[in-house]
């Protein structure tokens, strides 16, 4: 559910949460399945050369509201959505790059400082 | 208070398959995972695999798959496990256990003996 | 698999001693998350095991306060301050980090 730019997270679980892992797998995870006290999540982002990569995994309890709540940075494209309904419910997260504004068209995808 | 109850014994032939069950009471039963526990005499405690009941999601430890089927029955809140073609290895004392980020209560412990 | 090593196998105390079990594990059980999960139960004879101590040092509701635990990373102990004839039993410590979850092989208390 996004308000203002924002997306916020679900409520966390009393026990433990099973979520498919991608690019974003710890060392205790197990066939690309990591587990966690906070959160399951699917993010896309932009890399250096402008093309969408695609990660998910784990978020833990500890600092994962703020993360999963998606604000919006400048200058970069990401999008992020977190779950715990059920175990991998990752699986069936799919966010989408958040459009290209006006000033990204004249830049291009490669900020320079 | 938090219950979990199995059968204290059963007596199979080798080569047959069994249903061991686990019924809880006193919370929640979808708020918690359900393990299952090996013990045999000298051996001390093997986990076997665990249960999500709220989504019938499964982990199993690899030594244990082909051996054990995990599954649970909501509407009774009780929790089962299928062990199949046995053998004298698995004569063991089989314990549920409920689970959230650790296991904090247990079954007694179903004793299984496998003999012909 | 990540093994867990206790020692001693066999602890003969006197009732009113202090009773020291050590936990020590091939892998950390740091999880990602920063939580460590190493848990410590009773089991005392013809029955299951109960919870004494969850994630390295909380004790368990209705567990005395002469039961302790401490430790990190791969390297943990569980002490008893003054052993009651209640506590006799088998100590296992336990690990819920890495799949698949594993147990000590266990520590006798018994009376010396």
């Known amino acids: 559910k996004k308000e203002d730019g924002e997306s916020t997270a679900p409520t966390p679980r009393p026990k433990i949460l099973r979520c498919k892992c991608h690019h974003h797998c710890p060392e205790d995870s197990v066939n690309n399945i990591c587990s966690t006290d906070g959160y399951c999540f699917t993010m896309i982002e932009e890399d250096d050369s402008g093309m969408p990569v695609v990660t998910s995994g784990c978020l833990g309890l500890e600092g994962s509201d703020f993360q999963c709540r998606d604000t919006p940075i400048p200058h970069q494209r990401r999008s992020i959505e977190c779950c715990t309904e059920r175990n991998e419910c990752n699986k069936d997260l799919h966010p989408t790059l958040p459009p290209l504004k006006n000033r990204d068209f004249v830049d291009g995808p490669i900020h320079h400082k | 208070q938090v219950q979990l109850q199995q059968p204290g014994a059963e007596v199979v032939r080798p080569g047959a398959s069994l249903k061991l069950s686990c019924k809880a009471s006193?919370?929640?039963?979808?708020?918690?995972?359900m393990q299952w526990i090996k013990q045999r005499p000298g051996q001390g405690l093997e986990w076997i695999g665990e249960?999500?009941?709220?989504?019938?999601?499964?982990m199993y430890n690899q030594k244990f798959k082909g051996k054990a089927t995990l599954t649970v029955d909501t509407s009774s809140s009780t929790a089962y496990m299928q062990l199949s073609s046995l053998t004298s290895e698995d004569s063991a004392v089989y314990f549920c256990?409920?689970?959230?980020?650790?296991?904090?209560?247990w079954g007694q412990g179903t004793t299984l003996t496998v003999s012909s | 698999d990540v093994v867990m090593t206790q020692t001693p196998l066999s602890l003969p105390v006197s009732l009113g001693d202090q009773a020291s079990i050590s936990c020590r594990s091939s892998?950390?059980?740091?999880?990602?998350?920063?939580?460590?999960?190493l848990h410590w139960y009773l089991q005392k004879p013809g029955q299951s095991p109960n919870l004494l101590i969850y994630?390295?040092?909380n004790r368990f509701s209705g567990v005395p306060d002469r039961f302790s635990g401490s430790g990190s990373g791969t390297d943990f102990t569980l002490k008893i301050s003054r052993v009651e004839a209640e506590d006799l039993g088998v100590y296992f410590c336990?690990?819920?980090?890495?799949?698949?979850?594993?147990f000590g092989s266990g520590t006798k208390l018994e009376i010396k």
């Open positions: 256990a409920r689970f959230g980020f650790y296991v904090d209560y």
């Open positions: 006193g919370y929640t039963f979808t708020s918690y995972w």
């Open positions: 249960i999500d009941p709220s989504d019938n999601y499964t």
């Open positions: 892998q950390s059980l740091v999880h990602s998350t920063g939580n460590t999960y």
């Open positions: 994630k390295v040092s």
């Open positions: 336990s690990q819920s980090t890495h799949v698949p979850f594993t």
